[in-house]
């Protein structure tokens, strides 16, 4: 067995094993997506988070899972069975994914100001129509999740929520914000926790949540809430995690480039040593 043959054999099984791993990963992601779609309640209790934008994530996870499984399957079968058409398709899919990521990166960096303005418009529109339109649930749940995770409230300030009639209290107690703004770590006051927050948090996980204002979780804006707007919170988060984000993007890109190189190398060299390589299958 020549050096070239053993090298190709190594590449073949390396591609197979790695793509098998990604196939399993993709199927896990897909299963999570389906789990959320079928049974939201048990997923919420499993994850232990009240503010998970389930509706949107179920679809995102399911689609991502299928996509990952699809590409990985092409790589797996193409490498193992030494099928040039599948390896070529695998290379093409990875190239398309890589090109999309590069394009997105360029667009984000060049259109940053426009993108920021668009995000602000979207967020403020989501806040204004909070719990009034059943079709907007995904956006609202996603925004609740952002507030909860980034420990912020509103876009500019918590006061962004004061125009939302459905959250408003009576007369002098008008200023209220959603429970995702509530700073659980800052309170020792068990009364507000026991009577207001916890019962409503547990209810947030359920699929069949009515649209009545009585069923909307809101807290006084003067109590233990996050006082920073999410525009600042988002900037802080991006600033603090910039190295990680760039690192992950570079890592994913290099991984894709690596797999593309290996697949095209295997694809091109299958002709020369096809018969001899077949012995080691």
């Amino acid at each position: 067995m020549s050096a070239q043959e053993s090298c190709l054999s190594l590449i073949k099984y390396f591609l197979f094993v790695f793509n098998l791993f990604f196939f399993v990963l993709g199927s896990l992601i897909f299963c999570f997506g389906i789990w959320i779609l079928i049974d939201k309640t048990s997923f919420v209790s499993f994850v232990g988070l009240a503010f998970v934008p389930l509706q949107i994530w179920s679809k995102v996870l399911a689609i991502s899972g299928i996509f990952t499984m699809g590409i990985a399957l092409l790589g797996c079968v193409g490498a193992l069975k030494e099928l040039r058409c599948l390896l070529g398709l695998y290379f093409g899919m990875l190239l398309l994914l890589f090109a999309t990521q590069i394009t997105l990166g360029i667009l984000i960096s060049t259109q940053r100001v426009r993108l920021e303005r668009r995000v602000q418009e979207l967020v403020l529109r989501t806040i204004q129509s909070y719990r009034t339109n059943p079709d907007e649930t995904a956006a609202e749940e996603s925004w609740d999740y952002v507030q909860f995770q980034l420990r912020c409230c509103g876009w500019h300030y918590p006061q962004d929520w004061f125009q939302v009639l459905i959250l408003r209290g009576n007369g002098s107690e008008a200023h209220r914000v959603p429970c995702s703004c509530y700073n659980l770590s800052a309170t020792n006051d068990s009364t507000i926790l026991d009577k207001v927050i916890l019962p409503q948090l547990s209810r947030l996980g359920h699929l069949a949540r009515s649209r009545h204002s009585a069923d909307i979780c809101a807290v006084p804006a003067e109590s233990h809430i996050y006082r920073e707007g999410c525009a600042q919170g988002l900037q802080k988060w991006l600033h603090n995690n910039l190295i990680s984000i760039v690192g992950i993007c570079l890592g994913v890109g290099l991984l894709e480039l690596g797999f593309m190189t290996l697949s095209i190398f295997l694809c091109r060299n299958l002709d020369h040593v096809y018969n001899r390589l077949a012995r080691y299958r």
Partner: antibody
Framework: QVQVKESGPGLVAPSQSLSITCTVS????????VSWVRQPPGKGLEWLGV???????NYHSALKSRLSIKKDHSKSQVFLKLNSLQTDDTATYYC?????????WGQGTLVTVSA | DIQMTQSPASLSVSVGETVTITCRAS??????LAWYQQKQGKSPQLLVN???NLADGVPSRFSGSGSGTQYSLKINSLQSEDFGTYYC?????????FGGGTKLEIK
Amino acid sequence: QVQVKESGPGLVAPSQSLSITCTVSGFSLTTSGVSWVRQPPGKGLEWLGVIWGDGSTNYHSALKSRLSIKKDHSKSQVFLKLNSLQTDDTATYYCAKGGYSLAHWGQGTLVTVSA
Amino acid sequence: DIQMTQSPASLSVSVGETVTITCRASENIRSNLAWYQQKQGKSPQLLVNVATNLADGVPSRFSGSGSGTQYSLKINSLQSEDFGTYYCQHYWGTTWTFGGGTKLEIK
């Protein structure tokens, strides 16, 4: 029902510190903000600052360096301290329930800064 | 800081008339505005919050309106107890400010 009452020294010498106590009843300091506002004789209202339910504070930007607001939950009291007083700090000092709009006001305490 | 400009500074009106007081902010305050009434020698009283929301116990002849930077308080058929000084106050951002006040006097 909600009650808010300020108690202050009345007369303070220039360059000294002013301390006013606001005693509240009928609501919890953990869920409500308490604001401080002053009104110089014959003039308009000036917002000084607020202490929120969680103890965090917002201050008037021009007074930030010499103003501090604290509270004691157990005594249901909020404290205002203003350092390095000048004659133009002469005013009626009000404390009010509410951090955003001020729903219940105390009767105010007149503080005169004079030698 | 955001500046609040109130107009007019003073107003002489008869009982039964309708009056409108305006308040202009130096930037968009997104309806985070309150109106107060203060009578001579007394503490201010909240009338309206969130620009349009009537506070507890405030008569329906009072109404607030506006958005962005322009706001107004309207008092329909003035009563004798409505005379005094009116202040607007914004609570957008992290520091609040009051308007200069509008003194409402009996004609």
